[in-house]
């Protein structure tokens, strides 16, 4: 048994690092390997994490940690039964992708305007909390042609656009992304899409 | 009441061997790590040793390495400390103390908040 | 290893008045914001030690709020309001952010 592709980490900057990995030929992943991690501190013990699949040849092990500090190291063994298929050391604040924004809502209520709402993803006494930016793709099912990246660098998570620079009468998609410029992190996952109908008309003077 | 009890001290010769216990009552004995501080007559404390929760990680003074062990026996909430190949600078009083809870991912510091009253170990011909 | 230096290693003081320690570590004992892996301890005569401060700055259980802790990364200071006769005692800092554990010398604090 082999690895193809060493484990590569992320760490959400709050509680949970994702490891993922390709072995040499289709395994079981939860059956077969185990990946264990120690916190390189006074004391810390070993813990396992027990991997999915991820694909025929893939595995991804999502790894409970405490909060994440600059000084926190891990030592990473990969474990095929007794033998060590892989050992290497993994910096969570080195290596951070955000968690996703959530509870991405659209109110077409607002005169002229669209409103998108969100959620961020981190509690207020979290690092990241502000310091996320994020990126709002907004596109059409009805016109492919028809896609942007709206990008919002300041602290709100809200994008208001003026309604008329939409079509009206179709239907349009948006979802979020976010990542922490100081931090140095990759962009999150987006969040789910949701989708509302513009049935925003010109006033008859403008037309 | 959270107490910690040490017994095994005594006299014993130069080259000789003692095993240190630690009974722990009153916490969740597994869940810390403990410690073994010794003072010898006269002196300062001097850190000897730390055991984590689970025992996995095992800690010792260069003045001991390769002579003590360390150890821990969670069913019967007991910490050891075996020492061996004694010299006449192991003399002193051994305390064993509390230390961190270890079964989070890192360990929670609250000090060495409980300690026994001390066995005296005396090694001498 | 890390070094703790202690000063003074001898403090006569009167009851009622402050009293103040200081430790030195040879390396930063920071380890995240707030948590400096210092703490104080007290032995008094024939007993055990026992914790006065972990962490820089937390006050043990039971431990009386004259006795309060302060400072960050290599200097640390203990510091009795207002020393009462059930103080004196030899008062040791010690470092745990890494193994070996290391204690300063030991500070004895007497009554004047």
């Known amino acids: 048994m082999k690895v193809l592709q060493e484990p590569a980490c992320v760490s959400d900057y709050m509680s949970i690092s994702t490891c993922e990995w390709k072995m040499g030929g289709p395994t079981n992943c939860s059956a077969e390997l185990r990946l264990l991690y120690q916190l390189v501190f006074q004391s810390s013990e070993t813990h396992t994490c027990v991997p999915e699949n991820n694909g025929g040849v893939g595995c991804v092990c999502h790894l409970l940690m405490d909060d994440v500090v600059s000084m926190d190291n891990y030592t990473l063994d990969l474990w095929a039964g007794q033998q060590l298929l892989w050992k290497g050391s993994f910096k969570p604040s080195e290596h951070v992708k955000p968690r996703a924004p959530g509870n991405l809502t659209v109110h077409t209520n607002v005169s002229d305007t669209v409103l998108l709402t969100w959620s961020n993803p981190y509690p207020p006494d979290n690092y990241l909390y502000n310091d996320l930016t994020y990126a709002v793709n907004i596109w059409s099912e009805n016109d492919p042609a028809y896609s942007r990246i709206h990008n919002v660098t300041y602290l709100k998570p809200t994008l208001r656009i003026p309604a008329s620079t939409l079509k009206s009468g179709i239907s349009y998609r948006a979802r979020v992304r976010a990542w922490a410029q100081h931090y140095n992190t990759t962009w999150s996952e987006w969040s789910p899409s949701t989708k509302w109908y513009n049935s925003y008309r010109e006033p008859f003077e403008q037309r | 009441e959270v107490q910690l009890v040490e017994s095994g001290g005594g006299l014993e010769q130069p080259g000789g061997s003692l095993r240190l216990s630690c009974a722990g009552s009153?916490?969740?004995?597994?869940?810390?790590?403990m410690t073994w501080v010794r003072q010898a007559p006269g002196k300062g404390l001097e850190w000897v040793s730390s055991i984590s929760g689970g025992g996995g990680s095992t800690y010792y003074a260069d003045s001991v390495k390769g002579r003590f062990t360390i150890s821990r026996d969670n069913s019967k909430n007991t910490l050891y400390l075996q020492m061996n190949s004694l010299r006449a600078e192991d003399t002193a009083v051994y305390y064993c103390a509390k230390d961190r809870l270890s079964v989070t991912v890192r360990p929670r510091y609250y000090g060495l908040d409980v300690w026994g009253q001390g066995t005296t170990v005396t090694v001498s011909s | 290893d890390i070094v703790m230096t202690q000063s003074p290693l001898s403090l006569p003081v009167t009851p009622g008045e402050p009293a103040s320690i200081s430790c030195r570590s040879s390396q930063s004992v920071l380890y995240s914001i707030g948590k400096n892996y210092v703490d104080w301890y007290l032995q008094k005569s024939g007993q055990s030690p026992q914790l006065l401060i972990y962490l820089g700055s937390q006050r043990a259980t039971g431990v009386p709020d004259r006795f309060s802790g302060s400072g960050s990364g290599t200097d640390f200071t203990l510091k009795i309001s207002r020393v009462e006769a059930e103080d004196v005692g030899f008062y040791y800092c010690m470092q745990s952010l890494t193994s070996p554990y290391t204690f300063g010398q030991g500070t004895k604090l007497e009554i004047k």
């Open positions: 009153g916490f969740t004995f597994r869940d810390f790590a």
